[in-house]
């Protein structure tokens, strides 16, 4: 299964299966959830180790096990990889580090005011994997402001060096926020010039395609088919670049198909796994398993959840049966792809779905009326969970934020529901950053079913929280998919990073924003909470969040919308939004419902028809 | 050019036999998945039947599962469709045509022959 | 088996028109859905493949879009040779079934 949790001050020994440089262990984990072998993972921070060649050291691990032998060393941050987490993977990596230098080829180098300008410029450049920027404090002052654009054979730096004034982030192509945009089409009988970066064995063209869009380096390809006159060259599918970032040339040729990386598509990236199941084909590679299984359908399964499996083959030979079940075939390779693909078999072979980010039909859980005063404007993709809860009478308006939580559940407040408890009059739009751009052919979600807390009362704050259940489930995107709840009473963990976001008022008197508004947030004991309202009581059931000073809050129209806090590098939904005195009002910070403290509640009520409970763990 | 010409239909009486082939050429049959597609009067296509490029893998529809037999005999060229104990529900037009793996599509159709099943 | 929707069933258009048939899969397909041309009394012939990818051949006014459960054919400056009837068509999961189809009639 999925597991998420890191550990501290440990050190995962033997099973390397690479190693690199990466400027944290998320970036560490994100690259060994991508890698075809690996399953474990540790880092080791600048202040971990002396040895400067080790610094920001990423190694990648396997093992037959599925775990190694951990040894202390301090500061060391290791862990699994996010195969199997569903949602969780994403190559999408925004976090811009300060004091760093991520050294690599320095292929263009421009003057900007920011380092988000040049992050949007690496992110605009084609060959661009990763930056660096000297800010206006740099000690050389010629350098100051350099844009520099990189690239590597790895795609992830050479060298990282720590250095005062300059910040360094990754490209955010992989986050669908290429400004380039994509060339969908693929050709019939065109085979593309220039460098081979990589060769794998694929069954068609379109796995061909994905394994380019998710290579560091690959631009475009060539699939030369199951048909091609050479027979030792069938089914190859070659991984190229060019300087230009275009083929330089092509030629028409039979039995090839060509085309390009997705990886510069906007809003939208084919999901890095192979869904398709090939009749009559056969796919070669290690062994890992032999198990009868009915039907090849389940044989999918198998490898799925066979964390090591990387695709399989189902046989239908005679020999291979008895009564209803035949010989499931667990492979893997050491690129992924299968080191041999036969036709007119009786077989039938596909791949392990591990890295599919559609996840299963669940909530997201992990074991381990009111707008943002004083915030400023999110992005797209930055919360891609916040969705608004819109009313349609007469005219439409937005009226409530709620958290996507699984493919067909959202949590809200129950409070955005007084007056309101009519399912159909209800609009709820994902994925969306600028209420402005909602049109009459904006899809959106209709409520199958409104459930308000058996406990809430109308103009009471307690037990503020309400579920609903969508007519039809959504799928993932970059820019819509699911936060993951806290464990059942988490009181342990100390949030430090926490973020309230919506597009509610800016002021007390104010109005719906246009753009997603964020505000960090500190915490606030439930004692100086209810210090500062002493006429309320406030419940273990409820968190506070807000500055002694004020001046930053939820406010109306951010109701039911999340409070999220970041710990090891995933977020979590730890509040909805609920009420307080006015808004951003000095000593009246906000209070929202604590999750926690309904995760029994949650778990209950999100069990599907069958009983079967739709919370997913990824810990 | 590739060509797929069918062959062998006709009218035949409900619980009778027919054999349907179809001549392939312009291209490497031995190479290809192949496939019966049909048409009833007016209705829409109905995939009926794949074989994979050896004859090894064979696919049916419920419909006509334990009915029909696909084969194919690559020296010939060739593809079959057998059809046991018809129903007046099998009247169609049946195309043959031709699988391309590598872009997941059936890119060449014959013109298709007629069967029809009635007393 | 995987059941293809096709909408509208029929519609009526004029030379020169832009029309849109759409195509609903009943579990995600990924990319892997074709779409097809027939015209009357004649074998189908493939336009689309794979979702997006023109046939060789096939004039460019035609296009298709989309991924995983919903998908569109577009015929731009429609043309008196495209009154015909166009089937959707999966093929990622056996058997490879068809939609309906959707008849495009002179107005």
């Known amino acids: 299964g999925c597991l998420t949790q890191l550990y501290e001050n440990a050190f995962f020994r033997g099973g390397d299966v690479a190693s690199m440089y990466t400027p944290n262990a998320q970036y560490c984990q994100m690259r060994c959830t991508f890698h075809p072998r690996c399953l474990l993972f540790s880092f080791l921070p600048a202040s971990s180790i002396n040895d400067m060649e080790k610094r920001f050291g990423c190694f990648l691990k396997d093992s037959v096990t599925g775990t190694l032998p951990k040894v202390h060393r301090t500061g060391a941050v290791s862990g699994h990889s996010l195969k199997q987490c569903g949602h969780q993977i994403s190559a999408c990596h925004r976090d811009i580090y300060k004091g760093v230098d991520m050294r690599g080829v320095n292929f263009n180098v421009s003057k900007v005011s920011s380092v988000e300008e040049c992050q949007k410029r690496c992110t605009s450049n084609i060959r661009c994997q990763f930056f660096s920027y000297a800010t206006q404090t740099f000690h050389k002052a010629e350098y100051r402001n350099n844009c520099l654009l990189k690239y590597s054979p790895g795609g992830t730096p050479t060298a990282i060096k720590v250095l005062s004034n300059v910040e360094s982030g990754f490209s955010l192509k992989p986050c669908a926020l290429s400004e380039i945009g994509c060339h969908m089409n693929i050709f019939q009988h065109l085979a593309f010039s220039d460098v081979d970066v990589a060769r794998v064995l694929t069954p068609d063209a379109f796995v061909c395609r994905t394994i380019c869009t998710y290579h560091p380096n690959c631009l475009f390809f060539t699939f030369y088919t199951n048909v091609w006159k050479i027979e030792s060259q069938r089914n190859v599918c070659l991984l190229k670049t060019s300087e230009s970032g275009t083929p330089s040339s092509s030629t028409p040729q039979e039995n090839t198909i060509s085309g390009y990386s997705l990886l510069t598509c906007k809003r939208t990236l084919p999901e890095p796994c192979h869904s398709k199941i090939y009749p009559g084909v056969d796919f070669g590679g290690e062994e890992l398993n032999v198990t009868f299984v009915k039907g090849v359908n389940v044989c999918q399964e198998t490898c799925t959840k066979m964390i090591r499996c990387q695709f399989f083959t189902y046989s239908l030979l005679p020999e291979d049966c008895k009564e209803e079940k035949c010989k499931c075939f667990l492979r893997l390779s050491m690129d992924g792809s299968p080191t041999r693909i036969a036709y007119g078999t009786q077989g039938s072979s596909g791949y392990s779905l591990r890295l599919c980010n559609t996840g299963d039909n669940s909530v997201c859980t992990t074991k381990t009326s009111t707008r943002i005063v004083g915030g400023t404007n999110s992005s797209w993709g930055e919360w891609p969970w916040q969705v608004s809860l819109q009313v349609k009478l007469t005219a439409q308006r937005h009226l409530c934020g709620g958290s996507l939580i699984g493919h067909q559940w959202v949590l809200t407040a129950a409070h955005c529901f007084d007056g309101l408890p009519l399912q159909d009059v209800w609009r709820i739009y994902s994925g969306i950053l600028n209420l402005s751009d909602i049109t009459k052919d904006t899809p959106f979600s209709q409520i199958k079913e409104i459930i308000i807390h058996q406990n809430y009362k109308v103009s009471e704050g307690n037990h503020d929280i309400a579920l609903i259940k969508l007519q039809a489930p959504l799928n993932y995107t970059e820019f819509q998919k699911p936060i993951c709840l806290p464990s059942k009473g988490d009181t342990s963990t100390i949030y430090t990073n926490c973020w309230v976001t919506g597009w509610g008022f800016s002021k007390e008197k104010g109005e719906i924003q246009n753009i997603l508004q964020k505000v960090n947030i500190p915490l606030v004991t439930n004692e100086e909470c209810q210090k500062r309202y002493q006429d309320y009581k406030i419940t273990q059931r409820m968190v506070c969040a807000g500055y002694k000073e004020g001046g930053k809050d939820a406010c109306k129209g951010d109701s039911g919308g999340p409070l999220v806090c970041k710990h090891n590098g995933m977020w979590r939904l730890v509040g909805i939004t609920s009420w307080g005195e006015g808004c951003a009002r000095r000593e009246q910070p906000g209070v929202y419902t604590k999750v926690a403290e309904y995760m029994d509640w949650i778990l209950e009520k999100t069990q599907s028809s069958d009983g079967k409970a739709q919370m997913q763990s990824p810990a | 050019e590739v060509q797929l010409l069918e062959s062998g239909g006709g009218l035949v009486q409900p619980g009778g036999s027919l054999r349907l082939s179809c001549a392939a050429s312009?291209?490497?049959?031995?190479?290809?998945?192949m496939m019966w597609v049909r048409q009833a009067p007016g209705k829409g296509l109905e995939w009926v039947s794949s074989i994979g490029s050896s004859g090894g893998m064979t696919y049916y529809a419920d419909s006509v599962k334990g009915r029909f037999t696909i084969s194919r005999d690559n020296s010939k060229n060739t593809l079959y469709l057998q059809m046991n104990s018809l129903r007046a529900e099998d009247t169609a037009v049946y195309y043959c045509?031709?699988?391309?793996?590598?872009?997941?599509?059936?890119?060449?159709w014959g013109q298709g022959t007629l069967v029809t099943v009635s007393s | 088996d995987i059941q293809m929707i096709q909408s509208p069933s029929s519609l009526s258009a004029s030379v020169g028109d832009r029309v849109t048939i759409t195509c609903r899969a009943s579990?995600?397909?990924?990319?892997?859905l074709n779409w097809y041309q027939q015209r009357s009394g004649k074998a189908p012939k493939l336009l689309i493949f794979?979702?997006?990818n023109l046939q060789t051949g096939v004039p460019s006014r035609f296009s298709g879009s989309g991924s995983g459960t919903d998908f569109t054919l577009t015929i731009n400056n429609l043309q008196p040779e495209d009154f015909a009837t166009y089937y959707c068509q999966q093929s990622h999961t056996p058997p490879k079934t068809f939609g309906p189809g959707t008849k495009v009639d002179i107005k």
């Open positions: 579990q995600s397909i990924s990319g892997y």
């Open positions: 045509a031709r699988d391309q793996v590598a872009a997941a599509a059936i890119d060449y």
């Open positions: 794979a979702a997006s």
């Open positions: 312009g291209f490497t049959f031995s190479e290809y998945d």
